[in-house]
């Protein structure tokens, strides 16, 4: 009988203290003098001193009102001793249970709590979560059990009713319908925490449910109609900025404009983009207008928006009058650029050909020709008629001013508007190939050994162009052929130089006569340098000294 | 053994203020409560308080609600008492008691005299 | 408050007497009954606790009883040094007080 059953003591008691609590009792108090004393967290170690015994009778006493939310329970343990400090009883366990008094309120986790709803959701759509705590038990009491409510809406349109909350999850929902972020673009709710699920102390906070824009508003044109003025041929220009309102969230996806030409534009000369700022349509020419093909173009252009409507709308449609301005046209030359093939070399004054150039405008003006640029010199144009002739001699073989047969001219055609303007054309005259270049061997100076000689082979090189060319054929005049014998391969690109007798060592003029293909002959005289010496020599060794 | 030793004697004016205290060993201090007890020359005994050693919570008797203060320092095992206003009246033997509810151990007592 | 009368007020007794001092508490107080001796200039000492408790070291001559309103405290045999006031007190409700006191003198 040396037990006691758990004691539960009320937090927050009144006292008066020490309070009795039990009274621990040995049986063995019957035979001798007992002392009682008792060990233990809350009795001889921290926190110490909130329970005691009084030693002579056993009562168990508490010392100060508990707190169940810093402890809930205590373990103590119960000591029995005789007169002589003899243990007369083993360790008696005491458990001491503090139970709950509703002595808190609930505690929000946040004062403002915020959250966000996409406008024009049906009703039952979840919003947020919120969450208050209460240190009071929950488990074997309602005293921490929190129940949750809102106190009030503002503002209160379109109704004071357009959420709800769960009582016991805190989870905030959309019980109407009718949110619209236009109107009403956030709503503040006092929202209630009650401990006693719902019948105790009241605690209260703020949750600021912000509007999501949803993109149930079109963008409208203001105003619907424009009228612009272009001058013709300008590329990139600035037609017209147009403008548009949105109720949607500015700068959002459901704001942003896109703009969609959707007729007028049937030779696709305009383009719209939007301004990332003013998120104007900015239409512009994609190519230049014609005045005299078209003066005036109506276009019709449609605006939507970035994100696609949430539901159906009817979008809006502005139409722009465009006026296309005549300016006075630069002459163009037809074609631009004039490809003519003329033989060189012919005649001073001979025609080349006729480049002209067309006035877009209709107006009859009168066109004046000139050259812009000939590098060389060779050629002259009528500046009426546009008539190019010869007036130096065109040569496909001139290196500096011919690229691949290719002389290339500009001309310019000047027209009497007011003020004038001019156009260039580009003459590219292919010059034919006139076989007026003999063949001409290289090298032209050669040394060889006047005993053993090495056969001398000679590259032949013709500036005109096949069939003007190879195979060439080789000749020796002026008695040459007495000493050397020259001989073309078979390939006819190169001729052999060979010393058929003996010479001394001296310098030799060799005359060799080359001929193309076209009888084109030239006359070379090849510088010989004959040196005393066997087979292959580069320099003539000097005179041999005996010793 | 248990001892508690208390302050030496006090002659005050009315009007003052008289602070007792009372140093205790041979227990664990803050297990227990110190109670307060005058005796008036020729008069019998008179609880005025008593106060929890480890917490400081403290209980009065209502005669001297308002005008007693008691007060412990742990770090010293010393519990005081603080009568403030003294009139004539208030001239008795202060004694410290240690107990629960009964009283198992006394001071040697601390006379407080108040005179003009 | 608790009023707790003690009789008689003063005695006269012989060395070997049995002496009977009477408590009676205004209201209930259980056993929360206890009883000190004080001998002039000195402070009470403690007897009895919980009205029938001997505190150690107190002789068996000194003995207590009653519960509820009514307790009484017997010396068996009176010693000498048994010659004292000696006071009541409840500790059942605050404020705890005291009886008057009983002077026991030699006859």
């Known amino acids: 009988d040396w037990v006691v059953a758990p004691i539960s003591v009320p937090e927050n008691g009144k006292g008066p203290f020490p309070q009795r609590l039990n009274q621990l009792k040995s049986n063995k108090d019957r035979d001798t003098k007992i002392f009682y004393s008792i060990t233990g967290p809350g009795a001889d170690s921290p926190p110490e001193g909130v329970f005691a015994v009084e030693k002579e009778t056993g009562w168990l006493l508490l010392n100060k009102p508990l707190d169940r939310e810093e402890i809930a329970k205590y373990e103590l343990f119960g000591h029995a001793v005789s007169e002589n400090g003899a243990s007369v009883e083993d360790p008696m366990n005491i458990s001491i249970i503090v139970t709950d008094q509703n002595d808190h309120k609930p505690k929000f986790t946040q004062d403002t709590f915020r959250g966000s709803v996409l406008e024009g959701v049906l009703p039952g759509t979840s919003v947020m979560q919120v969450t208050a705590t209460d240190e009071d038990d929950a488990i074997y009491t309602y005293n921490g059990v929190v129940a949750y409510s809102i106190h009030s809406q503002e503002p209160k349109d379109p109704h004071d009713l357009m959420f709800t909350i769960h009582r016991s999850t805190g989870t905030i929902s959309v019980i109407s319908s009718g949110l619209d972020r236009e109107k009403v673009p956030e709503y503040t709710l006092t929202i209630q925490a009650t401990d006693m699920d719902g019948d105790g102390s009241t605690t209260t906070a703020v949750a600021v449910v912000e509007i999501l824009d949803a993109n149930d508003n079109a963008p409208m044109f203001d105003p619907q109609k424009y009228e612009a003025h272009v001058p013709e041929n300008a590329v990139g220009h600035e037609v017209q900025r147009l403008t548009v309102t949105d109720l949607d969230a500015p700068n959002s996806p459901a704001w942003r404009a896109t703009y969609l030409i959707m007729g007028g534009d049937d030779g696709d000369h305009f383009t719209i983009t939007t301004h990332p700022e003013s998120n104007q349509g900015i239409l512009t020419t994609r190519k230049g207008l014609d005045f005299e093909a078209k003066n005036q173009h109506t276009l019709y252009v449609e605006v939507t928006n970035e994100a696609p409507f949430v539901l159906k709308l009817p979008t809006s449609t502005a139409t722009i009058v465009v006026h296309v301005e005549d300016v006075n046209e630069a002459p163009v030359f037809v074609p631009p650029s004039k490809v003519v093939e003329v033989q060189e070399g012919i005649p001073t004054g001979e025609p080349v050909c006729v480049y002209t150039a067309e006035d877009p405008d209709k107006e009859n003006q009168k066109i004046s020709y000139r050259i812009l640029r000939d590098p060389a010199g060779w050629l002259a144009m009528d500046p009426d008629s546009g008539q190019v002739t010869a007036v130096g001699t065109l040569d496909r073989e001139d290196e500096q001013f011919v690229r691949n047969n290719i002389y290339e001219v500009m001309v310019l055609a000047m027209d009497n508007g007011s003020p004038p303007t001019t156009g260039t054309g580009t003459l590219l005259l292919t010059l034919i190939d006139v076989n007026d270049h003999g063949p001409v061997p290289e090298p032209r100076q050669i040394t060889i050994c006047n005993q053993s000689p090495v056969r001398q082979v000679l590259n032949i090189t013709d500036k005109d162009l096949s069939p003007h060319t190879s195979p060439f054929q080789a000749q020796l005049t002026d008695d040459s052929d007495i000493y050397w014998t020259a001989e073309v391969n078979e390939e006819g690109d190169t001729v052999v130089l060979s010393l058929k007798k003996f010479l001394k060592q001296d310098t030799y003029d060799v005359h060799l006569s080359l001929s193309d293909h076209g009888n084109k002959e030239q006359l070379t005289v090849i510088r010989a340098t004959v040196c005393d010496c066997h087979g292959h020599v580069e320099t003539c060794p000097g005179p041999w000294k005996g010793g | 053994q248990v001892q508690l030793v208390q302050s030496g004697a006090e002659v005050k004016k009315p009007g003052a203020s008289v602070k007792v205290s009372c140093k205790a060993s041979?227990?664990?201090?803050?297990?227990?409560?110190m109670h307060w007890v005058r005796q008036a020359p020729g008069q019998g005994l008179e609880w005025i308080g008593n106060i929890q050693l480890s917490y400081g919570n403290t209980n009065y008797a209502q005669k001297f609600q308002g005008r007693v203060t008691l007060t412990v320092d742990k770090s010293s095992s010393t519990a005081y008492m603080e009568l403030s206003s003294l009139r004539s009246e208030d001239t008795a033997v202060y004694y410290c008691?240690?107990?629960?509810?009964?009283?198992?151990?006394w001071g040697q007592g601390t006379l407080v005299t108040v005179s003009s | 408050d608790i009023q707790m009368t003690q009789s008689p007020s003063s005695l006269s007794a012989s060395v070997g007497d049995r002496v009977t001092i009477t408590c009676k508490a205004s209201q209930n107080v259980d056993t929360d009954v206890s009883w000190y001796q004080q001998k002039p200039g000195k402070a009470p000492k403690s007897l009895i606790y919980w009205a029938s408790n001997r505190f150690t070291g107190v002789p068996s001559r000194f003995s207590g009883s009653g519960s509820g309103t009514d307790f009484t405290l017997t010396i068996s045999s009176l010693q000498p040094e048994d010659f004292a006031t000696y006071f009541c007190e409840q500790y059942s409700s605050y404020p705890f007080t005291f009886g008057q006191g009983t002077k026991v003198e030699i006859k």
């Open positions: 041979g227990f664990t201090f803050t297990s227990y409560w």
């Open positions: 008691a240690r107990g629960f509810s009964y009283f198992d151990y």
